[in-house]
């Protein structure tokens, strides 16, 4: 039997200090450049080696960035999101969503994360 792929979604607050070339990650997404179909959110496409995000270690490629310094990133054009990061200041607080892929057992088998029983 084939296993079922589920996702464990968690949120985390990450505080980064801007380095000489920014916060050390690239973004994709926005209302004009959807990275995920039917989702105009802003996603991390690359963590730069030795950049602020890599040195912190918590932000991962594929994470969705929900807010920057408390400012929601919903329904933004790509360039407007970029401008938020560019102008966010020296100490930057990110609210991020991690989406961890979880491989469950065969369909019908209750996985560890199943709250029933």
């Amino acid at each position: 039997m084939n296993g079922r792929v589920d996702y464990l979604v968690t949120e985390e607050e990450i505080n980064l200090t801007r380095g000489p070339s920014g916060l050390g990650f690239n973004i994709v997404g926005g209302t004009d450049q959807q990275y995920v179909s039917n989702d105009s959110g802003i996603y991390v496409s690359r963590i730069k080696e030795n950049g602020a995000a890599a040195l912190d270690g918590r932000l991962q490629e594929g994470d969705k960035i929900l807010s920057v310094n408390g400012q929601d990133l919903k329904n933004l054009l790509h360039q407007d999101a970029v401008d938020l990061f560019r102008n966010a200041g020296y100490a930057v607080s990110l609210r991020v969503q991690h989406r961890l892929q979880v491989q469950n057992g065969p369909i019908g088998h209750r996985g560890e994360g199943d709250p029933s029983g």
Partner: nanobody, 126 residues
Framework: EVQLVESGGGLVQPGGSLRLSCAAS????????IGWFRQAPGKEREGVSC???????YYADSVKGRFTISRDNVKNTLYLQMNSLKPEDTALYYC????????????????????WGQGTQVTVSS
């Protein structure tokens, strides 16, 4: 310190070719979306060709089929191969990188990039 240094410009006849180079120091080129821009006297700056960190490319309509952007990650250098040059390609050519955007189209259309070179002059004239 992040630095971009362009070279390879010059005077060329219509129909000729040039290869521009942009050497990066202070950062790893393939971690960035980066591109080539040009500005002719009295005209607005124009995004010519850009490439994302994952290798997706964008070309302005005016250069499609004539110009090719490429990157050598070992030499940490960006290139622009320019063929079938026309007088209207005459301009000061710059390379520039975004610290955040990884969308090559947005980078080429942006007037808010983070690292710029000084430029190299390309003149197409007989």
């Amino acid at each position: 310190e992040v630095q971009l240094v362009e070279s390879g410009g010059g005077l060329v006849q219509p129909g000729g070719s040039l290869r521009l180079s942009c050497a990066a120091s202070g950062f790893t080129l393939d971690d960035y979306a980066i591109g080539w821009f040009r500005q002719a006297p009295g005209k607005e700056r124009e995004g010519v060709s850009c490439i994302s960190s994952h290798g997706s490319t964008y070309y302005a309509d005016s250069v499609k089929g004539r110009f090719t952007i490429s990157r050598d990650n070992v030499k940490n250098t960006l290139y622009l191969q320019m063929n079938s040059l026309k007088p209207e390609d005459t301009a000061l050519y710059y390379c520039a990188a975004s610290y955040y955007s990884d969308y090559e189209v947005a980078v080429c259309r942006s007037d808010a990039l983070d690292a710029w070179g000084q430029g190299t002059q390309v003149t197409v004239s007989s």
